[in-house]
């Protein structure tokens, strides 16, 4: 009689994560008597997947009734497949004895698992940066298989080219991770901008996953200052305004100095928002010039988002103060912060 052969007809099987894998195996003879065992891998590190004779294998079911004496179909199904199940599976016939000894192995079936990448997570720099600076964004996605994957970066829909991507590990693995770093040059108009990381993988059926980062969390647009003297409101009173324009984020503190001495400090509250997402604010100071013998140097000092203060000064001539000096050039800016100096 011809010697028993163990036939594994499928060289490879491809299964999506979460599904059930069926691994086929048949024997060509009932002799010798003895059980079948399934292993993942070969050599000393091979793992026992199923033992027909004994043991508890909750994820494994036999396709046919393997307990019947005349049965020669030793196919198994493994439920709830994960990337960790990938590998080559061997159906091995044992000869009954004390103990049973390995008799013949099938050629093996390679199980490949398709697993979706996790939603990409985009993270920006720890500290804010100002326009014209280059900042780095990272994008990470994990747990996908097979290894082939495509990652693209966009800023407001425009594809970026300055990025570096790594897929780990380099060698064979049950699943993979991707890590990419993109460099983005900030502009003053980026408060409303978005950076998008897009990941395409065979498991996603042409519907890529996206991760986003808002540049509003990354950018700091420093303010521009303008100090102007408004028309006189009443005899001996001069109205000085400090226009704080185009700043982001809103966190801003303004201090008025009179000849270098602190006169008043206030925090930006009623701001107006520009179309580009930046803010404007205006502070007024009502100066009683009759209380001064000499000229007054008024300084508007602004500390924005914890950065070193910037300032703009205005010299108020006490000797000659015409009724109209300067003009309100920013009609859209409103503020009502009045203070007399005595």
């Amino acid at each position: 009689e011809e010697e028993l052969q163990v036939i594994q007809p499928d060289k490879s099987v491809l299964v999506a994560a979460g599904e059930t894998a069926t691994l086929r195996c048949t024997a060509t003879s009932l002799i010798p008597v003895g059980p079948i065992q399934w292993f993942r891998g070969a050599g000393p590190a091979r793992e026992l997947i199923y033992n027909q004779k004994e043991g508890h294998f909750p994820r494994v079911t036999t396709v046919s009734e393997s307990t019947k004496r005349e049965n020669m179909d030793f196919s198994i199904s493994i439920s709830n497949i994960t990337p960790a199940d990938a590998g080559t599976y061997y159906c091995v016939k044992f000869r009954k004895g004390s103990p049973d000894t390995e008799f013949k192995s099938g050629a093996g079936t390679e199980l490949s698992v398709r697993a979706k990448p996790s939603a990409p997570v985009v993270s920006g720099p720890a500290a804010r940066a100002t326009p014209q600076h280059t900042v780095s964004f990272t994008c990470e996605s994990h747990g996908f298989s097979p290894r082939d994957i495509t990652l693209k970066w966009f800023k407001n829909g425009n594809e970026l080219s300055d990025f570096q991507t790594n897929v780990d590990p380099v060698g064979e693995s049950v699943s993979y991770s991707i890590h990419s770093t993109a460099k983005v040059v900030l502009t003053r108009e980026d408060v409303h901008s978005q950076v998008i990381c897009e990941v395409a993988h065979v498991t996603l059926q042409g519907d890529p996953l996206r991760g986003t980062a808002n540049l509003s969390e990354t950018i700091r647009v420093p303010p521009t200052l303008e100090v102007t003297q408004q028309p006189v409101r009443a005899e001996n009173q001069v109205n000085v305004t400090c226009q704080v324009r185009k700043f982001y984020p809103q966190r801003l503190q303004l201090t008025w100095l009179e000849n270098g001495n602190v006169s008043r400090t206030e925090t930006a509250s009623t701001v107006t928002e520009n179309k580009d997402g930046t803010y404007n604010w205006m502070s007024w100071l009502l100066v009683n010039v009759s209380a001064h013998r000499d000229d007054v140097k008024l300084t508007c000092q602004v500390e924005h988002d914890g950065q070193p203060a910037v300032s703009k000064s205005h010299d108020l001539k006490v000797s000659a103060h015409p009724k109209e000096q300067g003009s309100n050039t920013a009609a859209e800016n409103t503020g009502s912060n009045e203070r007399n100096i005595y």
């Epitope: 292993f39 590190a45 793992e47 026992l48 103990p99």
Partner: antibody
Framework: EVQFQQSGTVLARPGTSVKMSCKAS????????MHWVKQGPGQGLQWIGA????????TYNQKFKGKAELTVVTSTSTAYMEVSSLTNEDSAVYYC???????????????WGQGTLVTVSA | DIQMTQSPSSLSASLGERVSLTCRAS??????LNWLQQEPDGTIKRLIY???SLDSGVPKRFSGSRSGSDYSLTISGLESEDFVDYYC?????????FGGGTKLEIN
């Protein structure tokens, strides 16, 4: 009780070969892979390879392919390792140990032979 | 090949002290790690298998644990016979690899 008895100390000339043995007792020889491990003087442990007595299947560390050859005689429950083309680098203690026929945690490298000292000298 | 980086390579400690030896795996090995003890005469004995399972006959002062890719052997309350060499071994995939060893010396 499981025991591995290894052959005695060997003094060999460079360029020659040595064949050492490891006799297993106390359990079923054919249910286990027999492994060999090298330890150079004052050095750590290096896995050489393993053999499965049922079908003489062997697996080697790439570093020892062509240097070591593993064989078994099932009837005497003895594993052998031959180390060829000896150089000073082959002077070491060689240990045998075992693992189950599949990767069973509790059975990995539990029992060890006492080691065979090989000294290569002109 | 999976690299097993063992630290420290030598360690001086006093009787009764608690010490920890660490092995870091370069790739995922799951829980497939043994800790071995080697006497000065060359005798090798397994202490721990599967990262944290204690072999029978091994004193309870020996314990194994894992944090990510770092595997530790802790000896709480050193006794005189513990001042020998220790090795970790990964048996997750071939070639099976050992850590470089730790020589535990008495202070």
């Amino acid at each position: 009780e499981v025991q591995f008895q290894q052959s005695g100390t060997v003094l060999a000339r460079p360029g020659t070969s040595v064949k050492m043995s490891c006799k297993a007792s106390g359990s079923t020889f054919t249910s286990y892979w027999m492994h060999w491990v090298k330890q150079g003087p004052g050095q750590g442990l290096q896995w050489i390879g393993a053999i499965y007595p049922v079908n003489n299947d062997t697996t080697y560390n790439q570093k020892f392919k062509g240097k070591a050859e593993l064989t078994v005689v099932t009837s005497t429950s003895t594993a052998y390792m031959e180390v060829s083309s000896l150089t000073n680098e082959d002077s070491a203690v060689y240990y045998c140990t075992r693992s189950f026929y599949y990767s069973l945690d509790a059975a990995w490298f539990v029992y060890w032979g006492q080691g065979t000292l090989v000294t290569v000298s002109a | 090949d999976i690299q097993m980086t063992q630290s420290p390579s030598s360690l001086s400690a006093s009787l009764g002290e608690r010490v920890s030896l660490t092995c870091r795996a370069s790739q995922d090995i799951g829980s497939r790690l043994n800790w071995l003890q080697q006497e000065p005469d060359g005798t090798i004995k397994r202490l721990i298998y599967a990262t944290s399972s204690l072999d029978s006959g091994v004193p309870k002062r020996f314990s194994g644990s894992r944090s990510g890719s770092d595997y530790s052997l802790t000896i709480s309350g050193l006794e005189s016979e513990d001042f020998v060499d220790y090795y970790c071994l990964q048996y997750a995939s071939s070639p099976f690899t050992f850590g470089g060893g730790t020589k535990l010396e008495i202070n």
